[in-house]
Interface confidence: medium
């Protein structure tokens, strides 16, 4: 709770806040933990402390390390830790994961992307915004205060957004960039009673004895991200794992697909080396969610190996 990760790029400004909840009247002392050396408060230093804030103007890779802040009130002292990492600038366009701030989600109705950490800096509008390293142009994009607003958001708007601004300290300017991912969520999502697309109810599937057979259970549950939705197979009313026939296995994991905007899941049942006794079993494709459960039953019938009609 009182230790915080901060990161930045070399030759950019980085300002870190003591992770302690402090009042303006508290005094804050900063130390470099490895050496226990006090951080100066004089602004002529490249790295200096200013109350709750620790300023790197600009940052250098060698500044990386753990910094201790001690918040002092008349009745107590409290300690916080800032774990600072300064990275070399990348020559290519890709922003590595370790430089990314938290992902934000937007939708048609709400598409604000907030520029991370900007409130710590002394900056003036306008902000510059980039998506996947390309400067954003066009009337759909509006830089408003510390936000980027995107009009008529589409799924293609998902991606990595970088804000760039200038921090001013005593007349000197320093560049700052910060990147976060933006995902687009469909606000029109809904869930409905499961609809099983395959197999058909009471379907008879022809199989060849001694060969392998696959049965696919596929169901749709609504539009958008679904919670507590699942498809599975049962044999004679028993879970596959409990049935105890190693030749018959459910495909590990469920494949999620979006067909016509619908959220669908499918589960493949694999039967190796089909035997006569497999024809006597009842195969149930089950689809369930918060609305309830739907079951389609399949039976197997022997296919004559020399019968090649479709």
């Amino acid at each position: 709770k009182f230790s915080k990760q901060s990161w930045g790029l070399e030759n950019e400004a980085l300002i870190v806040r003591c992770p302690r909840q402090g009042k303006p009247s508290y005094t804050v002392d900063w130390y470099y933990s490895q050496t226990n050396k006090s951080i100066p408060t004089q602004e002529r230093n490249r790295v200096f402390a200013s109350g709750q804030l620790l300023k790197f103007l600009p940052a250098a890779v060698a500044d990386s390390g753990i910094y201790t802040c001690i918040v002092r009130s008349p009745t107590f002292n409290r300690t916080g830790y800032a774990n600072v990492t300064i990275y070399k600038k990348q020559s290519d366009c890709n922003v590595p994961d370790y430089l990314m701030y938290s992902t934000v989600s937007g939708s048609e109705k709400n598409s604000k992307i907030y520029c991370p950490t900007i409130d710590l800096y002394n900056w003036t509008a306008p902000l510059e915004w980039f998506k996947n390293c390309q400067a954003l142009q066009g009337s759909r994009y509006r830089a408003h205060k510390s936000f980027l607003v995107i009009d008529n958001v589409m799924t293609e708007d998902a991606g990595d957004y970088t804000c760039k601004f200038i921090h001013n300290e005593n007349g000197a300017n320093y560049s700052v960039t910060a990147t976060r991912s933006f995902t687009v969520k469909d606000e029109q999502g809904f869930s409905l009673f499961p609809v099983i697309g395959a197999p058909a109810q009471n379907e008879i599937k022809e199989v060849e004895i001694g060969k392998n057979a696959n049965l696919t259970c596929s169901a749709c549950f609504g539009k958008g991200t679904q919670f507590l939705a699942a498809v599975l197979w049962q044999l004679n009313g028993t879970k596959i794992t409990d049935f105890g026939e190693p030749r018959i296995q459910q495909e590990e994991g469920q494949n999620q697909s979006f067909s016509n905007g619908l959220a669908c899941l499918d589960m493949v049942l694999r039967i190796a080396d089909v035997k006569e006794e497999d024809l006597l079993l009842q195969y149930d494709c089950l689809a369930l969610n918060l609305h309830g459960l739907r079951r389609h039953t399949v039976r197997l019938s022997r296919k004559n190996p020399i019968d090649h009609h479709s």
């Epitope: 709770k1 909840q21 009042k23 009247s25 918040v71 009130s73 008349p74 009745t75």
Partner: antibody, heavy 117, light 106 residues
Framework: EVQLVQSGAEVKKPGATVKISCKVS????????MHWVQQAPGKGLEWMGR????????EYAEKFQGRVTITADTSTDTAYMELSSLRSEDTAVYYC??????????WGQGTLVTVSS | DIQMTQSPSSLSASVGDRVTITCITN??????IHWYQQKPGKVPKLLIY???TLRPGVPSRFSGSGSGTDFTLTISSLQPEDVATYYC????????FGQGTKLEIK
């Protein structure tokens, strides 16, 4: 030396309201947070709420929400806790305590409130 | 609401014994737990804050450990003056005290 001095014991009837004061010395009340804690006879400690005297922000425990009001007068370095609609189970020692947002470092001597008809 | 389960509710130990008191929360609270000592007829006193930081002036036989949901107060060598009730306090979400542990000397 930091000191918190609370007002004296009170005897109240059920349904009445009690207001306890807590005066701090050797520091400025707005520099810290002020918490209030209840301790019924022979029982444990129960946090009631806190105030940031500098800006007047308050937070109350769910159990006391709606019945407790914590205030502070920065000109006299005094905090107050008012508890209304008193019932017999409110008979307790009430402590003020100063500290940060998360913990109490210094405590007042306590004020005994007896609720009896 | 965060619930605190403090155990034991009372314990009796001999001078020189190692004593441990535990507090378990129903949700992860980082290290925002504190330990208080209340001697009979006295006001509570902060011993340890934020899991393991000893308050200045508190004897080094007291220590705090744990993280997440399980926290422990340890007295490495019990002294007669340690007779008191000990409380844990979580402050991750509002503040909640444990039920208290009454410590006596055998």
């Amino acid at each position: 030396e930091v000191q918190l001095v609370q007002s004296g014991a009170e005897v109240k009837k059920p349904g009445a309201t009690v207001k306890i004061s807590c005066k701090v010395s050797a520091f400025n009340i707005k520099d810290d947070y002020m918490h209030w804690v209840q301790q019924a006879p022979g029982k444990g400690l129960e946090w009631m709420g806190r105030i940031d005297p500098a800006i007047g922000n308050t937070e109350y425990a769910e159990k006391f929400q709606g019945r407790v009001t914590i205030t502070a007068d920065t000109s006299t370095d005094t905090a107050y806790m008012e508890l209304s609609s008193l019932r017999s189970e409110d008979t307790a020692v009430y402590y003020c305590a100063t500290g940060d947002f998360y913990a109490m470092d210094y405590w007042g001597q306590g004020t005994l409130v007896t609720v009896s008809s | 609401d965060i619930q605190m389960t403090q155990s034991p509710s009372s314990l009796s130990a001999s001078v020189g014994d190692r004593v441990t008191i535990t507090c378990i929360t129903n949700t992860d609270i980082d290290d925002v737990i504190h330990w208080y000592q209340q001697k009979p007829g006295k006001v509570p006193k902060l011993l340890i804050y934020e899991g393991n930081t000893l308050r200045p002036g508190v004897p080094s036989r007291f220590s705090g450990s744990g993280s997440g949901t399980d926290f422990t107060l340890t007295i490495s060598s019990l002294q007669p003056e340690d007779v008191a009730t000990y409380y844990c306090l979580q402050s991750d979400n509002m503040l909640t005290f444990g039920q208290g542990t009454k410590l006596e000397i055998k």
